[in-house]
Interface confidence: low
């Protein structure tokens, strides 16, 4: 009203949605009697009577506040329960006596929004887009008043930037009067943003002060063209025949291009496409020397149809060929000499070793083994091992059998066998020579012959012990083109009172076996042979 003194600013009361606002009438006793007060709400400059106080007794007026108002503090304070956003307005109390005075209260209402929900653009963003593309959407539900949103990339706040960053925010009012904020971040991204972390932050106020809530961090799929492709080979290092080798294409683009792996044909020098598995990996299993060669990868961008070629990768599958020994089946007279030569091809430097097959003893380090003044003991197996020292496990071997001409040579000349009458005896007799001998027995029984190796034969005889057999004994005779030789087996009855050390006390003498003792075939040569190596 013109001429009146300017009204003082209303008192500010701040509360959270759902709580109770205490509206204290600030009229002094001189300004009015608090036992006679009218309370009004002011909305859009329209006053509505909501509560009367008479003689200190309160009475709600019909309307929106009817159920939520009560008098407190001996009539000085009006309590408004279950505050809603719609209650954000001015409330005034008016004293009637001695003259009409009023006191105004501004009610401010607050509600923290829910945790912000961030959704990344699932379709992704190409780096070469002409204008900012949608990166992510942030939604903050049920806040009051409208919270403020800030977008972050790698922990740094993003500002609007012409043609680069655009933040588009909108809000809706729920039936409760609370706000839901939706903010869309649009940006032009670069390749380096493929690992960038984006999140949104909601800033809001409560009676207790300023607060904020952060969304989770998200990365957005960024599509950028491939600039280079390259090949990767596993395992790393020297490869050998038999290995499982994987050749894969890699590219620095997203999405990766369509890969094909080619190998240069050594004859035509043309690149020929190889068949890869479902993952685009060329698996060589087992790897062979033929897999060696120059490989390259082609990456084809199916959108632009631009093709990129990798730098060629030279693949070497190391190998050792079949080992050849000459002579392949040597035969020599006793006293003569023999030179064994070993040959093999490899992609790397080879190391040769000659081993005695029966003992594993290393006889020579090198491709040539010379044997002089051959004795019959020198007959038997010799193994050449061709290996690549720099690649563990890469080796090939060949066994050669040396035959020394000579008449049969018996494993034993004579032997005593303890027996019991009427037992079935199992006898064995072994002989060697070249040509390989045959064995005959001087008694009837069931005999069987087994070739032990090219120069050695073993004959076993099952025979019943009779008094006649005890008297005559048993002889086995080995013969070949160069002569014959005999072994004698003396049979003696077991005297149960005087068991000799030769008697078999563990088996109850159900059988007796006459056979040669195990022996190491030593080889006579001109050099002192090295001790067997520990080949761990």
């Amino acid at each position: 009203v013109p001429g009146e003194a300017e009204q003082p600013a209303p008192e500010l009361v701040e509360v959270e949605v759902g709580s109770t606002a205490l509206l204290k009438c600030g009229l002094s006793q001189s300004q009015g009697n608090l036992s006679h007060v009218d309370w009004f709400s002011v909305h859009k400059e329209k006053r509505t009577l909501i509560f009367r106080v008479r003689q200190g007794q309160g009475q709600s007026e019909p309307g929106e506040y009817e159920q939520r108002l009560s008098l407190q503090d001996r009539g000085a304070t009006l309590a408004l329960t279950q505050v809603t956003p719609q209650d954000e307005r001015i409330f005034l109390c008016q004293g009637k006596r001695p003259r009409s005075q009023e006191y105004r209260i501004q009610l401010r209402v607050y509600k923290a929004p829910e945790e912000p929900n961030i959704q990344v653009n699932p379709l992704g963003i190409p780096v070469n887009s002409k204008e900012p593309e949608e990166v992510a959407t942030c939604v903050g539900r049920n806040g009051y008043p409208i919270p403020q949103v800030i977008w972050y990339k790698n922990g740094r706040p993003l500002k609007e930037e012409k043609n680069r960053v655009h933040i588009q925010s909108s809000q809706t009012v729920e039936s409760s009067g609370l706000y839901t904020l939706q903010s869309i971040l649009k940006a032009q991204l670069v390749k380096e943003d493929k690992d960038a972390q984006f999140y949104c932050e909601l800033n809001y106020r409560l009676p207790s002060g300023n607060h904020m809530k952060e969304s989770r961090e998200v990365t957005v799929p960024v599509f950028y063209p491939t600039e280079k492709v390259w090949l990767e080979v596993e395992p790393v290092g020297m490869l050998k025949e038999g290995d499982r080798v994987e050749i894969r294409c890699l590219a620095d683009g997203n999405p990766p291009p369509h890969f094909s792996i080619s190998k240069q044909n050594p004859s035509t020098r043309e690149a020929e496409e190889e068949t890869t598995n479902d993952n685009g990996v060329l698996v060589l299993e087992p790897a062979r020397k033929e897999h060696s060669g120059r490989y390259e990868c082609q990456g084809l961008d199916l959108d632009t149809m631009i093709s990129l070629l990798s730098e060629p990768q030279e693949l070497l599958v190391n190998y050792v060929s079949d080992v050849r020994v000459s002579p392949a089946a040597p035969e020599r007279q006793e006293g003569s000499s023999l030179t064994l030569t070993c040959e093999a091809e490899s992609s790397q430097d080879l190391e040769f070793q000659w081993l005695r097959e029966e003992t594993g003893q290393v006889l020579e380090r090198g491709p040539v083994l010379q044997l002089h003044d051959l004795k019959r003991e020198a007959g038997g197996g010799y193994r050449c091992v061709a290996s690549v020292p720099s690649i563990p496990g890469l080796n090939r071997t060949q066994l050669v059998n040396v035959a020394i001409f000579g008449p049969p040579w018996m494993a034993f000349k004579e032997r005593k066998v303890w027996v019991k009458e009427n037992m079935v005896l199992n006898l064995s007799c072994e002989a060697s020579g070249h040509p390989r001998p045959t064995i005959s027995w001087n008694v009837n029984g069931t005999a069987s012959e087994q070739d032990q190796d090219p120069q050695r034969v073993l004959s076993t005889l099952n025979v019943l012990v009779t008094p006649e057999l005890l008297e005559t004994g048993v002889e086995c005779t080995a013969s070949n083109d160069l002569g014959k030789n005999t072994s004698i087996l003396f049979l003696e009855l077991v005297n149960l009172t005087t068991l000799t050390p030769d008697s078999n006390t563990t088996t109850g003498l159900s059988t007796s076996t006459a056979s040669p003792h195990t022996r190491a075939n030593s080889t006579s040569t001109e050099r002192k042979l090295p001790e067997p190596e520990s080949r761990g």
Partner: antibody, heavy 120, light 107 residues
Framework: QVQLVESGGGVVQPGRSLRLSCAAS????????MHWVRQAPGKGLEWVAV????????YYADSVKGRFTISRDNSKNTLYLQMNSLRAEDTAVYYC???????????????WGQGTTVTV | DIQMTQSPSSLSASVGDRVTITCRAS??????LAWYQQNPGKVPKLLIY???TLQSGVPSRFSGSGSGTDFTLTISSLQPEDVATYYC?????????FGPGTKVDIS
Amino acid sequence: QVQLVESGGGVVQPGRSLRLSCAASGFTFSSYAMHWVRQAPGKGLEWVAVISYDGSNKYYADSVKGRFTISRDNSKNTLYLQMNSLRAEDTAVYYCARSIFGVVIDYGMDVWGQGTTVTV
Amino acid sequence: DIQMTQSPSSLSASVGDRVTITCRASQGIRNYLAWYQQNPGKVPKLLIYGASTLQSGVPSRFSGSGSGTDFTLTISSLQPEDVATYYCQKFSSPPFTFGPGTKVDIS
């Protein structure tokens, strides 16, 4: 035996140019990607540049991009590093080194030269 | 670009001790990692390539492990000649950055 020998180092004023050479012997130079690596006094190793076996691919460290050029002459078994617009921070021992399996995206550098000193 | 970090920056150990140096890449580099040894006043020497493959001629007390972002160089029994600075280097894609180095000496 396999050997790399650098040359061409010296004292130069800032802003000037220098060309380093690396002579290779004992292996098939034209089959291997080659690198330049440098080491400032009392500091660690810094990779400078690489060139593919045939010279078609070249990559540089950000600190030298646009100022240094790597090249090779396979007929002379020689690797080069042309250094322009030299700065005080380019002062270092420069080594040339060979890629272990000969390709650019490789697994290591197995043969190194003794290095040549550049003082700016 | 991918950054390479090494820890510790220096260490002191006794002869015969087991020594472990770690190298970390800011992004995955599969097994494209090499380890070098540089003795005082000498040229760098390749010890390990492909993260775990021992270069020929390197004593077996050196070993490497790891894949992706975390890698380890181990000296199983430190010897006087192992006093040096050790560097890791990534080879996944250019630039082929070195780690800052770890100085090893004998206490």
